[in-house]
Protein backbone atom coordinates (compact mmCIF):
# COMPACT_ATOMS: atom_id res chain seq x y z
CA UNK A 1 0.00 0.00 0.00
CA UNK A 2 2.95 2.34 0.48
CA UNK A 3 4.02 2.22 -3.17
CA UNK A 4 2.92 5.20 -5.22
CA UNK A 5 -0.35 4.90 -7.10
CA UNK A 6 -1.44 7.14 -9.95
CA UNK A 7 -5.14 7.90 -9.59
CA UNK A 8 -7.23 9.05 -12.51
CA UNK A 9 -10.69 8.93 -10.98
CA UNK A 10 -12.62 9.57 -14.17
CA UNK A 11 -12.84 6.77 -16.71
CA UNK A 12 -14.43 9.17 -19.17
CA UNK A 13 -15.19 12.85 -19.61
CA UNK A 14 -17.47 14.58 -22.10
CA UNK A 15 -16.77 18.12 -23.31
CA UNK A 16 -18.41 20.37 -25.88
CA UNK A 17 -16.23 21.60 -28.73
CA UNK A 18 -14.67 24.95 -27.90
CA UNK A 19 -14.77 24.35 -24.15
CA UNK A 20 -11.98 23.22 -21.81
CA UNK A 21 -11.47 19.63 -20.73
CA UNK A 22 -10.40 19.01 -17.16
CA UNK A 23 -8.52 15.76 -16.54
CA UNK A 24 -7.83 14.80 -12.95
CA UNK A 25 -4.74 12.98 -11.73
CA UNK A 26 -3.40 12.45 -8.24
CA UNK A 27 -0.43 10.68 -6.68
CA UNK A 28 -0.62 8.86 -3.37
CA UNK A 29 3.02 9.57 -2.51
CA UNK A 30 5.82 12.06 -3.12
CA UNK A 31 8.23 9.16 -3.67
CA UNK A 32 9.92 8.41 -5.99
CA UNK A 33 11.16 11.82 -7.06
CA UNK A 34 10.54 12.60 -10.71
CA UNK A 35 8.24 14.47 -13.09
CA UNK A 36 4.78 13.59 -14.35
CA UNK A 37 3.74 13.73 -17.97
CA UNK A 38 0.40 13.52 -19.71
CA UNK A 39 0.01 11.55 -22.94
CA UNK A 40 -2.79 10.90 -25.37
CA UNK A 41 -2.81 7.24 -26.31
CA UNK A 42 -0.49 4.48 -25.17
CA UNK A 43 2.53 2.69 -26.56
CA UNK A 44 5.22 3.95 -28.89
CA UNK A 45 2.90 6.25 -30.83
CA UNK A 46 1.55 8.13 -27.85
CA UNK A 47 1.39 11.93 -28.05
CA UNK A 48 2.93 14.10 -25.33
CA UNK A 49 0.33 16.54 -24.03
CA UNK A 50 2.14 18.00 -21.05
CA UNK A 51 5.54 17.61 -19.40
CA UNK A 52 5.90 18.96 -15.88
CA UNK A 53 9.67 19.28 -16.29
CA UNK A 54 10.06 21.13 -19.58
CA UNK A 55 8.42 22.29 -22.77
CA UNK A 56 5.79 24.74 -23.97
CA UNK A 57 2.17 23.58 -23.95
CA UNK A 58 0.05 26.65 -24.71
CA UNK A 59 -3.34 24.93 -24.48
CA UNK A 60 -2.59 23.19 -21.18
CA UNK A 61 -2.86 24.69 -17.73
CA UNK A 62 -2.38 22.92 -14.43
CA UNK A 63 -5.24 23.08 -11.95
CA UNK A 64 -2.90 23.13 -8.94
CA UNK A 65 0.44 24.84 -8.43
CA UNK A 66 2.72 21.95 -9.29
CA UNK A 67 5.77 23.53 -7.69
CA UNK A 68 3.96 23.76 -4.35
CA UNK A 69 5.61 21.69 -1.66
CA UNK A 70 3.94 18.31 -1.04
CA UNK A 71 1.62 18.75 -4.02
CA UNK A 72 -0.09 15.50 -5.05
CA UNK A 73 -2.51 16.97 -7.60
CA UNK A 74 -1.44 16.80 -11.25
CA UNK A 75 -4.75 17.60 -12.92
CA UNK A 76 -4.69 19.55 -16.16
CA UNK A 77 -7.11 21.58 -18.23
CA UNK A 78 -6.90 21.62 -22.03
CA UNK A 79 -8.48 24.65 -23.67
CA UNK A 80 -10.42 25.06 -26.91
CA UNK A 81 -11.23 21.38 -27.36
CA UNK A 82 -11.91 20.13 -30.89
CA UNK A 83 -13.02 16.69 -32.14
CA UNK A 84 -9.37 15.98 -32.96
CA UNK A 85 -8.62 15.98 -29.23
CA UNK A 86 -10.77 12.91 -28.57
CA UNK A 87 -8.91 9.92 -27.18
CA UNK A 88 -7.66 8.37 -23.99
CA UNK A 89 -5.35 10.47 -21.83
CA UNK A 90 -2.83 8.96 -19.42
CA UNK A 91 -1.12 10.59 -16.48
CA UNK A 92 2.29 9.01 -16.13
CA UNK A 93 4.78 9.26 -13.26
CA UNK A 94 8.50 9.12 -14.11
CA UNK A 95 11.33 8.31 -11.75
CA UNK A 96 14.30 10.66 -11.87
CA UNK A 97 17.20 9.01 -13.66
CA UNK A 98 20.50 9.71 -15.35
CA UNK A 99 20.73 10.57 -18.13
CA UNK A 100 17.00 10.02 -18.70
CA UNK A 101 14.00 9.74 -16.43
CA UNK A 102 12.37 6.32 -16.39
CA UNK A 103 8.65 5.64 -16.64
CA UNK A 104 7.48 4.41 -13.25
CA UNK A 105 3.70 4.11 -13.24
CA UNK A 106 0.71 5.15 -15.33
CA UNK A 107 -2.85 6.01 -14.41
CA UNK A 108 -5.70 3.95 -15.82
CA UNK A 109 -6.53 6.58 -18.42
CA UNK A 110 -9.45 8.94 -19.01
CA UNK A 111 -11.34 8.78 -22.30
CA UNK A 112 -12.20 12.23 -23.65
CA UNK A 113 -15.22 12.48 -25.92
CA UNK A 114 -16.12 15.70 -27.70
CA UNK A 115 -19.70 16.83 -28.16
CA UNK A 116 -20.87 19.21 -30.85
CA UNK A 117 -20.79 22.85 -29.80
CA UNK A 118 -24.21 23.87 -28.38
CA UNK A 119 -26.15 25.91 -30.92
Amino acid sequence: EDELQVIQPEKSVSVAAGESATLRCAMTSLIPVGPIMWFRGAGAGRELIYNQKEGHFPRVTTVSELTKRNNLDFSISISNITPADAGTYYCVKFRKGSPDDVEFKSGAGTELSVRAKPS
Epitope: E1, Q5, I7, P9, E10, K11, S12, V13, S14, V15, A16, E19, S20, A21, T22, R24, A26, M27, T28, V63, S64, L72, D73, S75, S77, A108
Partner: antibody
Amino acid sequence: QLQLQESGPGLVKPSETLSLTCTVSGGSISSNSYYWGWIRQPPGKGLEWIGSIYYSGSTYYNPSLKSRVTISVDTSKNQFSLKLSSVTAADTAVYYCAREVGAPPSYPFDIWGQGTMVTVSS
Amino acid sequence: DIQMTQSPSSLSASVGDRVTITCRASQSISSYLNWYQQKPGKAPKLLIYAASSLQSGVPSRFSGSGSGTDFTLTISSLQPEDFATYYCQQAYSHPFTFGGGTKVEIK
Protein backbone atom coordinates in the same frame (compact mmCIF):
# COMPACT_ATOMS: atom_id res chain seq x y z
CA GLN B 1 -21.39 30.07 4.16
CA LEU B 2 -21.94 28.22 0.92
CA GLN B 3 -25.38 26.67 0.44
CA LEU B 4 -26.99 24.53 -2.26
CA GLN B 5 -30.69 24.45 -3.07
CA GLU B 6 -32.42 22.00 -5.42
CA SER B 7 -35.54 23.01 -7.32
CA GLY B 8 -37.82 21.37 -9.85
CA PRO B 9 -41.05 19.42 -10.21
CA GLY B 10 -41.83 16.83 -7.57
CA LEU B 11 -43.90 14.71 -9.94
CA VAL B 12 -42.86 13.46 -13.37
CA LYS B 13 -44.77 11.15 -15.70
CA PRO B 14 -43.21 7.88 -16.93
CA SER B 15 -41.22 8.24 -20.19
CA GLU B 16 -40.85 11.99 -19.65
CA THR B 17 -37.74 13.95 -18.66
CA LEU B 18 -36.89 14.85 -15.08
CA SER B 19 -35.34 18.32 -14.79
CA LEU B 20 -33.76 19.73 -11.65
CA THR B 21 -31.65 22.79 -10.93
CA CYS B 22 -29.22 23.40 -8.10
CA THR B 23 -28.58 27.00 -7.12
CA VAL B 24 -25.31 27.77 -5.34
CA SER B 25 -25.29 30.71 -2.94
CA GLY B 26 -22.58 32.12 -0.72
CA GLY B 27 -19.78 31.21 -3.14
CA SER B 28 -18.88 30.95 -6.79
CA ILE B 29 -19.61 27.89 -8.89
CA SER B 30 -16.61 28.91 -11.02
CA SER B 31 -14.02 27.99 -8.40
CA ASN B 32 -11.36 25.69 -9.82
CA SER B 33 -11.25 23.85 -6.49
CA TYR B 34 -14.62 22.13 -6.75
CA TYR B 35 -16.81 19.93 -8.89
CA TRP B 36 -20.60 19.87 -8.60
CA GLY B 37 -22.47 16.61 -8.37
CA TRP B 38 -25.87 14.95 -8.30
CA ILE B 39 -26.63 11.99 -6.03
CA ARG B 40 -29.96 10.23 -5.56
CA GLN B 41 -31.53 8.03 -2.91
CA PRO B 42 -34.62 5.89 -3.60
CA PRO B 43 -37.02 5.65 -0.65
CA GLY B 44 -35.57 3.45 2.08
CA LYS B 45 -32.45 2.69 0.05
CA GLY B 46 -28.85 3.79 -0.28
CA LEU B 47 -27.06 6.54 -2.18
CA GLU B 48 -26.22 6.49 -5.90
CA TRP B 49 -23.86 8.93 -7.62
CA ILE B 50 -25.42 10.20 -10.87
CA GLY B 51 -22.68 12.45 -12.19
CA SER B 52 -20.64 15.61 -11.76
CA ILE B 53 -19.64 18.71 -13.68
CA TYR B 54 -16.75 21.18 -13.55
CA TYR B 55 -17.44 24.86 -14.10
CA SER B 56 -15.66 24.76 -17.47
CA GLY B 57 -18.25 22.29 -18.75
CA SER B 58 -16.47 18.95 -18.39
CA THR B 59 -19.05 16.32 -17.43
CA TYR B 60 -18.65 12.95 -15.75
CA TYR B 61 -21.52 10.43 -15.62
CA ASN B 62 -22.33 7.14 -13.95
CA PRO B 63 -22.18 4.59 -16.79
CA SER B 64 -25.38 2.98 -15.53
CA LEU B 65 -27.27 6.21 -16.31
CA LYS B 66 -25.04 7.80 -18.95
CA SER B 67 -27.41 7.25 -21.89
CA ARG B 68 -30.19 9.16 -20.11
CA VAL B 69 -28.32 11.87 -18.17
CA THR B 70 -27.28 15.40 -19.05
CA ILE B 71 -25.65 17.71 -16.51
CA SER B 72 -25.00 21.33 -17.45
CA VAL B 73 -23.73 24.46 -15.75
CA ASP B 74 -24.71 28.12 -16.00
CA THR B 75 -21.95 30.14 -14.38
CA SER B 76 -23.78 33.43 -14.91
CA LYS B 77 -26.63 32.19 -12.70
CA ASN B 78 -24.39 30.20 -10.35
CA GLN B 79 -26.46 27.10 -11.12
CA PHE B 80 -26.04 23.58 -12.43
CA SER B 81 -28.76 21.33 -13.71
CA LEU B 82 -29.72 17.69 -14.15
CA LYS B 83 -31.85 16.19 -16.89
CA LEU B 84 -32.80 12.51 -16.77
CA SER B 85 -34.78 11.26 -19.76
CA SER B 86 -37.20 8.35 -20.23
CA VAL B 87 -37.89 8.04 -16.53
CA THR B 88 -39.60 5.07 -14.91
CA ALA B 89 -40.85 4.34 -11.39
CA ALA B 90 -37.30 3.14 -10.57
CA ASP B 91 -36.15 6.76 -10.85
CA THR B 92 -38.35 7.80 -7.92
CA ALA B 93 -35.93 9.12 -5.32
CA VAL B 94 -34.71 12.05 -3.29
CA TYR B 95 -32.26 13.92 -5.53
CA TYR B 96 -29.39 15.78 -3.88
CA CYS B 97 -26.94 18.24 -5.34
CA ALA B 98 -23.57 18.44 -3.65
CA ARG B 99 -20.17 20.10 -3.84
CA GLU B 100 -17.29 17.73 -4.55
CA VAL B 101 -13.80 18.72 -3.44
CA GLY B 102 -11.76 18.69 -6.64
CA ALA B 103 -8.29 17.97 -5.29
CA PRO B 104 -6.82 14.97 -3.51
CA PRO B 105 -7.05 13.33 -1.13
CA SER B 106 -10.33 11.52 -1.66
CA TYR B 107 -12.66 13.98 -3.45
CA PRO B 108 -15.40 14.07 -0.76
CA PHE B 109 -18.86 15.60 -1.13
CA ASP B 110 -18.49 18.18 1.61
CA ILE B 111 -21.62 20.32 1.21
CA TRP B 112 -25.06 19.00 0.25
CA GLY B 113 -28.41 20.50 -0.65
CA GLN B 114 -31.37 19.46 1.47
CA GLY B 115 -32.67 17.20 -1.29
CA THR B 116 -35.86 17.19 -3.35
CA MET B 117 -38.22 14.24 -3.65
CA VAL B 118 -39.15 13.32 -7.21
CA THR B 119 -41.91 10.80 -7.82
CA VAL B 120 -42.40 9.16 -11.20
CA SER B 121 -46.05 8.32 -11.63
CA SER B 122 -48.83 8.77 -14.15
CA ASP C 1 -17.40 -0.77 -10.69
CA ILE C 2 -15.89 -0.87 -7.21
CA GLN C 3 -18.30 -2.48 -4.74
CA MET C 4 -18.43 -1.18 -1.17
CA THR C 5 -19.67 -3.56 1.51
CA GLN C 6 -20.57 -2.27 4.95
CA SER C 7 -21.09 -4.30 8.09
CA PRO C 8 -23.13 -4.61 10.09
CA SER C 9 -26.19 -3.33 8.23
CA SER C 10 -27.67 -2.30 11.58
CA LEU C 11 -26.68 -2.32 15.23
CA SER C 12 -28.19 -1.44 18.58
CA ALA C 13 -26.11 0.45 21.11
CA SER C 14 -26.44 2.56 24.22
CA VAL C 15 -25.28 6.09 24.93
CA GLY C 16 -21.61 5.94 25.94
CA ASP C 17 -20.87 2.76 23.97
CA ARG C 18 -17.92 2.45 21.62
CA VAL C 19 -19.24 1.68 18.13
CA THR C 20 -17.27 0.32 15.19
CA ILE C 21 -18.51 0.12 11.59
CA THR C 22 -16.49 -1.55 8.85
CA CYS C 23 -16.37 -0.96 5.12
CA ARG C 24 -14.67 -3.21 2.58
CA ALA C 25 -13.85 -2.27 -1.02
CA SER C 26 -13.83 -4.87 -3.81
CA GLN C 27 -10.38 -3.62 -4.85
CA SER C 28 -7.70 -1.41 -3.38
CA ILE C 29 -8.75 2.24 -3.17
CA SER C 30 -5.69 3.56 -1.31
CA SER C 31 -7.12 6.07 1.19
CA TYR C 32 -9.81 7.42 -1.13
CA LEU C 33 -12.58 6.61 1.34
CA ASN C 34 -15.13 9.00 2.87
CA TRP C 35 -17.69 8.52 5.66
CA TYR C 36 -21.09 10.25 5.93
CA GLN C 37 -23.81 10.44 8.57
CA GLN C 38 -27.46 10.70 7.54
CA LYS C 39 -30.44 11.34 9.79
CA PRO C 40 -34.04 10.65 8.66
CA GLY C 41 -35.31 13.26 6.22
CA LYS C 42 -31.93 15.01 6.06
CA ALA C 43 -29.05 15.14 3.61
CA PRO C 44 -25.87 13.18 4.33
CA LYS C 45 -23.17 15.00 6.27
CA LEU C 46 -19.45 14.46 5.68
CA LEU C 47 -17.69 13.12 8.78
CA ILE C 48 -14.36 11.70 7.62
CA TYR C 49 -12.46 12.11 4.36
CA ALA C 50 -9.34 10.39 3.07
CA ALA C 51 -10.04 7.44 5.39
CA SER C 52 -8.89 9.18 8.58
CA SER C 53 -9.15 12.98 8.29
CA LEU C 54 -11.83 14.57 10.45
CA GLN C 55 -14.01 17.07 8.61
CA SER C 56 -14.06 20.54 10.17
CA GLY C 57 -16.72 20.89 12.84
CA VAL C 58 -17.15 17.15 13.41
CA PRO C 59 -16.71 16.00 17.03
CA SER C 60 -13.46 14.23 17.84
CA ARG C 61 -15.30 11.14 19.08
CA PHE C 62 -15.54 10.18 15.40
CA SER C 63 -12.44 8.62 13.88
CA GLY C 64 -11.58 6.64 10.77
CA SER C 65 -8.82 4.23 9.89
CA GLY C 66 -7.75 1.85 7.16
CA SER C 67 -6.16 1.79 3.73
CA GLY C 68 -6.38 -0.42 0.68
CA THR C 69 -9.56 -2.45 0.99
CA ASP C 70 -10.50 -2.41 4.68
CA PHE C 71 -11.73 0.63 6.58
CA THR C 72 -13.27 1.39 9.95
CA LEU C 73 -15.39 4.19 11.38
CA THR C 74 -15.31 4.39 15.17
CA ILE C 75 -17.48 6.41 17.53
CA SER C 76 -15.59 6.38 20.81
CA SER C 77 -18.53 7.27 23.06
CA LEU C 78 -21.94 7.24 21.42
CA GLN C 79 -24.07 10.34 22.02
CA PRO C 80 -27.85 10.69 21.60
CA GLU C 81 -27.37 12.75 18.43
CA ASP C 82 -25.27 9.98 16.83
CA PHE C 83 -28.20 7.65 16.22
CA ALA C 84 -28.33 7.73 12.43
CA THR C 85 -27.32 5.82 9.30
CA TYR C 86 -23.67 5.86 8.26
CA TYR C 87 -22.37 5.41 4.71
CA CYS C 88 -18.89 4.87 3.32
CA GLN C 89 -18.00 6.07 -0.18
CA GLN C 90 -15.07 5.37 -2.47
CA ALA C 91 -13.68 8.19 -4.59
CA TYR C 92 -10.85 6.24 -6.20
CA SER C 93 -12.56 5.54 -9.50
CA HIS C 94 -15.76 6.48 -11.29
CA PRO C 95 -18.49 5.66 -10.78
CA PHE C 96 -18.09 6.78 -7.19
CA THR C 97 -19.97 4.22 -5.09
CA PHE C 98 -21.43 4.09 -1.60
CA GLY C 99 -21.77 1.29 0.88
CA GLY C 100 -25.25 0.04 1.72
CA GLY C 101 -25.31 1.88 5.02
CA THR C 102 -25.22 0.98 8.71
CA LYS C 103 -28.15 2.04 10.85
CA VAL C 104 -27.20 2.77 14.47
CA GLU C 105 -30.24 2.40 16.70
CA ILE C 106 -30.90 2.89 20.39
CA LYS C 107 -30.72 -0.30 22.46
